[in-house]
């Protein structure tokens, strides 16, 4: 079964930076990465960025920076520009679209007492499969 | 063949705002993101913003999220952006243009420019 | 935001020769998906909208010269127009395509003896 793993990250010489890590464990052709906060995509939660292996990639505001680290995981840079956007407390979610599979989404959060550079335990949620 | 249609010229007063359009034709609207491009007389291009036609989601360059407002209109495939409290800094030609799904931001496709002037 | 920075800012070159300009990235532009760079480069000839060239550093857009030669990966690329001619007078600019928001670099201009 296949499974989605996500990890957020505080960066330990910049308080107000994070990075969300997201893979995907299984096999199936990726087809489109989307990575929301504050809930799963199209549940609540609000896109910051969509990552297609081809096209290219689209982020929005607060995001900073999507990137494919290899052809099952990705990293987005996001840059808190303080209240208005508490990322110690919000949950990121990671959705992978892949052939033959459908959709498999996994959701993470910086832990309350993470130290900077300290990051999530890699622990596959799934939250949902879309099809 | 696609073709983006712009108006030629603007003149309007500093402190107002402008709508410029870009009409569409030749492609199906909606199937691909309209972007906008702002080039000052003899610089370089900076990108302001883009908008889905098919579901109006907008994306903007943080430098020009509080000046323009991108908005499409689908009974004349016409995409419009709107620029407000203007000042000198915002004379320039403003491009729109399309992509054909090479890459999310290749731009194939551009429209002739619209130049606007801003002096009282 | 990716900067992209050109080089030269002009040159002058005659019919026949050959032309190579460059453009830096701040960051690597490889996708790591694919190994794809996801850099582009535009014709903007006097008086007229830019064109697109090439996208991908390397591929062509359809209809384009074959005298057009993009090429380099990472953050280090090159146009190259193997035997220049009278009509590709124009200012040449770089963009990176790889993510929001897409920047350009300041422009290369074309003139020819």
């Known amino acids: 079964t296949p499974e989605v793993w996500v990890q957020v990250q505080m960066e330990a010489t910049e308080l107000s930076s994070f990075t969300v890590h997201c893979g995907f464990l299984g096999p199936g052709s990726i087809s489109l990465v989307t990575v929301s906060w504050g809930g799963p995509d199209g549940a609540g939660g609000t896109k910051l960025a969509v990552l297609h292996p081809e096209l290219g990639t689209r982020q929005w505001a607060p995001a900073r920076q999507a990137r494919w680290e290899t052809q099952s995981s990705i990293s987005l840079a996001l840059e808190d520009s303080g209240a208005s956007s508490p990322f110690a407390n919000t949950t990121f979610c990671c959705k992978f679209a892949s052939f033959p599979e459908g959709s498999w989404e996994s959701c993470g959060s910086l832990p309350p007492s993470s130290d900077p550079g300290l990051s999530a335990p890699p622990t596959p949620v799934p939250i949902l499969r879309a099809d | 063949q696609v073709q983006l249609q712009q108006p030629g010229a603007e003149l309007v007063k500093p402190g107002t705002s402008v709508k410029l359009s870009c009409k569409a034709a030749?492609?199906?609207?909606?199937?691909?993101?309209m972007h906008w491009v702002k080039q000052r007389p003899g610089q370089g291009l900076e990108w302001i913003g883009e908008?889905?036609?098919?579901?109006?989601?907008?994306n903007y360059n943080e430098k020009f999220k509080n000046k323009a407002t991108l908005t499409v209109d689908h009974s004349s495939s016409t995409a419009y952006m709107q620029l407000s409290s203007l000042t000198s800094e915002d004379s320039a030609v403003y491009y729109c243009?399309?992509?054909?799904?090479?890459?999310?931001?290749?731009?194939?496709?551009w429209g002739q420019g619209t130049s606007v002037t801003v002096s009282s | 935001d990716i900067v992209m920075t050109q080089s030269p800012s002009s040159l002058a070159m005659s019919v026949g020769q050959k032309v190579t300009m460059s453009c830096k990235s701040s960051?690597?532009?490889?996708?790591?998906?694919?190994?794809?760079?996801?850099l582009a480069w535009y014709q903007q000839k006097p008086g007229q909208s830019p064109k697109l060239l090439v996208y991908?550093?390397?591929t062509r857009d359809s209809g384009v010269p074959d005298r057009f030669i993009g090429s380099g990966s990472g953050t280090d690329f090159t146009l190259t127009i193997s035997s220049v001619q009278a009509e590709d007078l124009a200012d040449y600019f770089c963009?990176?395509?790889?993510?929001?928001?897409?920047?350009f670099g300041g422009g290369t201009k074309l003139e020819i003896k």
């Open positions: 243009a399309s992509n054909a799904d090479r890459a999310y931001y290749t731009m194939d496709y």
């Open positions: 030749g492609y199906i609207f909606t199937s691909s993101w």
């Open positions: 908008i889905n036609p098919s579901d109006g989601r907008t």
């Open positions: 960051q690597s532009l490889l996708n790591g998906f694919n190994q794809r760079n996801f």
């Open positions: 991908f550093a390397s």
């Open positions: 963009q990176q395509h790889y993510s929001t928001p897409p920047t």
